[in-house]
Interface confidence: low
């Protein structure tokens, strides 16, 4: 009966860096001739291993093929890389000049499992303000097989992406994923996180996460109020300028007297609120006896390179 070449596994999956065995058994020792392993078919097929004296780095025979009774022509490929993916054929030749191919196994497809890179989440270059819609993009690369799941979350709530693409669309040794999600910012988002979660067969149910802290992408402008306290003595008036619920910390506060700069504050001791925003209070003591006329005091707050917010307060002359 005609020799049969049997490759029992139709496919094997192996993690990048690991080794895999490709099994091949023959049903007969005859006719005499070499057995060779190829990746691919046709003119472009690549010789992977030949059971002769040639040396093939990373590929070794599993059993002693020199024994006359041996019918096992399995090979082990070590330190597998994504480039090793493909269909491998165990091929029997009949000795001659040249050798002629007489039978091939059905092929074993090698799927190389490569882990996705840790997801990287990028957001807008400029900070957004509450009620503004901003886009975040998550990217991960180098994974195989192509099947992958990507989910977005904000504070534990799943978000629906605008689009998710896996490239390339055709067969390849490894793949990349990119996904974009739109988030509507709100003033409570300073402590919020946007999380991109990637699940893949190689990750053993422990998805990879990329995190964007919304504190890096949001600007909450302060509410500014100027109030006059009850005078502590006949000659003194206390003015308070309060900047409330702002983020980030970058704040400059200037007191003006009838339009002229009177004092520059560079806040040091900011109060942090539970929602992550800050408050700052500046006290300004006015010597009322020095003012016969009404005086307009201005508190000017510059926050995070934004246009100044000004609040005026008139202190009546004595």
């Amino acid at each position: 009966t005609e020799v049969k070449v049997i490759q029992p596994e139709k496919s094997v999956s192996v993690a990048a860096g690991d080794s895999t065995v490709l099994n091949c058994t023959l049903t007969s020792l005859l006719p005499v001739g070499p057995i060779r392993w190829y990746r691919g078919v046709g003119q472009s097929r690549q010789l992977i291993y030949s059971f002769t004296t040639e040396h093939f780095p990373r590929v070794t025979n599993v059993s002693d093929a020199t024994k006359r009774s041996n019918l096992d022509f399995s090979i082990r490929i070590s330190n597998v890389t994504p480039e090793d993916a493909g269909t491998y054929y165990c091929v029997k030749f009949q000795r001659g000049s040249p050798d002629t191919e007489i039978q091939s196994g059905g092929g074993t497809e090698v799927y190389v499992l490569a882990k996705p890179s840790p997801p990287e989440v990028s957001g807008p270059a400029d900070r957004g303000i509450p009620d503004q819609k901003v886009n975040f993009t998550c990217k991960s690369h180098g994974f195989s097989p192509r099947n992958i799941t990507l989910k977005w979350f904000k504070d534990g709530q799943e978000l629906h992406p605008l689009e998710t693409t896996v490239n390339p669309s055709g067969k390849n040794v490894s793949y990349n994923i990119s996904s974009t999600v739109r988030v509507v910012l709100n003033s409570m988002d300073v402590n919020s996180k946007v999380i991109c979660e990637v699940a893949h067969i190689t990750l053993d149910r422990s998805p990879l996460r990329g995190i964007a802290n919304l504190s890096n992408f949001i600007r909450v402008s302060p509410t500014v109020k100027v109030t006059q306290q009850s005078p502590t003595s006949m000659n003194q008036v206390n003015l308070t300028c309060r900047a409330e619920r702002f983020y980030p910390e970058d704040l400059q506060l200037i007191w003006l007297e009838n339009g002229n700069v009177s004092r520059n504050d560079t806040p040091k001791n900011l109060t942090k609120n539970t929602d992550g925003t800050y408050n700052y209070t500046s006290l300004f003591l006015v010597n009322s006896s020095a003012h016969r006329e009404d005086v307009v005091f201005t508190c000017q707050v510059k926050h995070d390179q934004q246009p100044a917010i000004t609040r005026n307060h008139t202190v009546l002359g004595f």
Partner: antibody, heavy 119, light 107 residues
Framework: QVQLQESGPGLVKPSQTLSLTCTVS??????????WSWIRQHPGKGLEWIGA???????YYNPSLKSRVTISVDTSKNQFSLKLSSVTAADTAVYYC???????????WGQGTTVTVSS | DIQMTQSPSSLSASVGDRVTITCQAS??????LNWYQQKPGKAPKLLIY???NLATGVPSRFSGSGSGTDFTFTISSLQPEDIATYYC?????????FGGGTKVEIK
């Protein structure tokens, strides 16, 4: 025409080893081109592949049973056999042997033998 | 392991009806799928191999199609002798796994 026939005890005590043999008639087990398989079916349930052997050596087991299963072939008797150790009531099933062609499925089956695990 | 999900789990149809059973694999198995028929108290019988090839001696009213993850088994005109449970089985990845079965009855 190839035929398969399972044989072995119908009752096995818990913790003991279940041993079954499949005799091939009408063809040689060592003619090549086929795997010789064991499959079981729990009462009223679906089919579970246990493992398979090729006459010249390669053996494949279901990982869920691998620690307890041994499949062997005896070409001189044209038989292959199954041993399942440390059995429990959960191993009560109809056990089938079958011939599997490389690309033609399990085309020949034995009629099946019922094995009950009970003390 | 590859999970094979068969649906429906049971169906009732009239003689002459066209009956369709689907089988879904948990990942791509190319066309490495077989279909079997099992009558009560009997061993399974191979009907279709490699997803669409009719096994020797099987009537042409049985057919199979599909590739990748989704497969279909069809009986073009149900006959009384077709009362049985039908199973799909993948052989792309070890261990070979079967679907849960579809019990076909006559109305």
């Amino acid at each position: 025409q190839v035929q398969l026939q399972e044989s072995g005890p119908g009752l096995v005590k818990p913790s003991q080893t279940l041993s079954l043999t499949c005799t091939v008639s009408g063809g040689s087990i060592s003619s090549g081109g086929y795997y010789w398989s064991w499959i079981r079916q729990h009462p009223g349930k679906g089919l579970e592949w246990i493992g398979a052997i090729y006459y010249s050596g390669p053996i494949y087991y279901n990982p869920s049973l691998k620690s307890r299963v041994t499949i062997s072939v005896d070409t001189s008797k044209n038989q292959f056999s199954l041993k399942l150790s440390s059995v429990t009531a959960a191993d009560t099933a109809v056990y089938y042997c079958a011939r599997e062609g490389y690309h033609s499925g399990m085309d020949v089956w034995g009629q099946g033998t019922t094995v009950t695990v009970s003390s | 392991d590859i999970q094979m999900t068969q649906s429906p789990s049971s169906l009732s149809a009239s003689v002459g009806d066209r009956v369709t059973i689907t089988c879904q694999a948990s990942q791509d198995i190319s066309n490495y799928l077989n279909w079997y028929q099992q009558k009560p108290g009997k061993a399974p019988k191979l009907l279709i191999y490699d997803a669409s090839n009719l096994a020797t001696g099987v009537p042409s009213r049985f057919s199979g199609s599909g590739s990748g993850t989704d497969f279909t088994f069809t009986i073009s005109s149900l006959q009384p002798e077709d009362i049985a449970t039908y199973y799909c089985q993948q052989f792309a990845y070890l261990p070979w796994t079967f679907g849960g079965g579809t019990k076909v009855e006559i109305k």
